[in-house]
């Protein structure tokens, strides 16, 4: 028996359902009574879901997993993982035993898009050219950790005097705060780009300083 899984990681958005694909080629005359199927976490071997003795033994993992019972006899051993969480990320092994055995691992990559950044300025009044200002770009509830880029109005990257911090909340999602300290010119636009490296999703925020008033 040969077990096949997708070589590319499965990317799943937080709170959505994901399917970890696994298949095998049944021999002629195969019946489900002959099948033993185990899904387990690759690193710890923690049991996730099992099928044995002709019966789905159910989820051993937060009661959020399911097989596709009608497709098992055709060799479809895929696992459905519901309401994906950050903590579900990792490698899952599909182990199939009939008169022979084989196993293969599939990676689950969890992702969550970042919110549109909000921009704040300090100080935010009586601004004059030559003043040092602090611009903060904040984006929320994303995963995994973001990449943050700053540019000026001409699209020139701003890399000096940038401090970025990322904090995970209780669900494992990140809030990102990036602070740019810059000396004001006569006027200017400062933009912040928050990129989710897995989703290749870019969230943009900008602030334009033209004396008074400020535009965000």
């Amino acid at each position: 028996v040969e077990v096949q899984v997708s070589e590319d990681p499965v990317v799943a958005l937080v709170d959505t359902d994901a399917t970890l694909r696994c298949s095998f080629s049944p021999e002629p005359g195969f019946s489900l009574a002959q099948l033993n199927l185990i899904w387990q976490l690759t690193d710890t071997k923690q049991l996730v879901h099992s099928f044995t003795e002709g019966r789905d033994q159910g989820s051993a993992y937060s009661n959020r997993t399911a097989l596709f019972p009608d497709l098992l006899v055709q060799g479809n051993a895929s696992l459905r993982l519901q309401r994906v969480r950050v903590t579900d990320e990792g490698s899952y092994t599909c182990f199939v035993s009939i008169q022979d055995f084989d196993s293969a691992a599939v990676s689950l990559q969890v992702a969550a898009p970042y919110s549109k950044p909000s921009m704040t300025l300090e100080p935010n009044k009586d601004l004059r050219p030559g003043n040092m200002v602090t611009i903060t770009c904040s984006s929320y509830q994303g995963y995994p950790e973001a990449e943050v880029f700053w540019k000026d109005g001409q699209g020139v990257p701003l890399t000096g005097n940038v401090t970025t911090s990322q904090m995970a909340n209780e669900r494992g999602l990140f809030d990102v705060h990036s602070v740019l300290r810059v000396v004001l010119g006569a006027n200017g636009t400062y933009s912040c780009l928050v990129r989710n490296p897995v989703l290749q999703q870019d969230a943009h925020g900008s602030v334009t300083i033209t004396g008074q008033p400020l535009t965000f």
Epitope: A33, Q34, S50, T52, E53, S97, Q99, D100
Partner: antibody
Amino acid sequence: EVQLLESGGGLVEPGGSLRLSCAASGFSFSSYGMHWVRQAPGKGLDWVAVINGEGSGTYYADSVKGRFTISRDNSKSTLYLQMNSLRAEDTAVYYCTKYYYNYAMDVWGQGTTVTVSS
Amino acid sequence: QSVLTQPPSASGTPGQRVTISCSGSRTDIGTTSVNWYQQLPGTAPKLLIYQSHQRPSGVPDRFSGSKSGTSASLAISGLQSEDEADYYCASWDASQNTWVFGGGTKLTVL
């Protein structure tokens, strides 16, 4: 008739090596996983290792991991167990067995005796 | 020390019914099938029960197996003198990816 015939056992000193063979007949050898199971004198059965039909997957008991290697030659319908760094506690009758549904072992050889002693 | 627990011995008189127990855990018997082997004196083991309750062809229906939770049992009814042997339960341990045997039960027919 399905048959398994082990060979290669014998007396070996501690730290020595031995290679066991198991010749299979009467079934499509490459379609089945195969095990080695041992039994020390007067003791119970002790699982040693397993290999899948195409030889790409293996598992070992902790007690032999890193010292024993299970392999197979499907063109010769033969299973092997290479045993290195042998210890006195490896003394046993070694059986090769055929993989069966639901993790069972449905055919057993007659066994070959390995004695590790100085 | 065996991962699966069996009584070291059991006995019965001819015609009697004898039961041998096998206790495991959630990751072996609780997750997968139990198989039973009979080893007559001086011979190789023989598969007696697979998939917890199935008999291979040639095994008399006096032998039956059952499983509940993390325990299993082998029942032999109408005990005969030729049933005197060692009996082993076995399973696959999903937490270790290894096969595990019970310590064996020596059955004596009185």
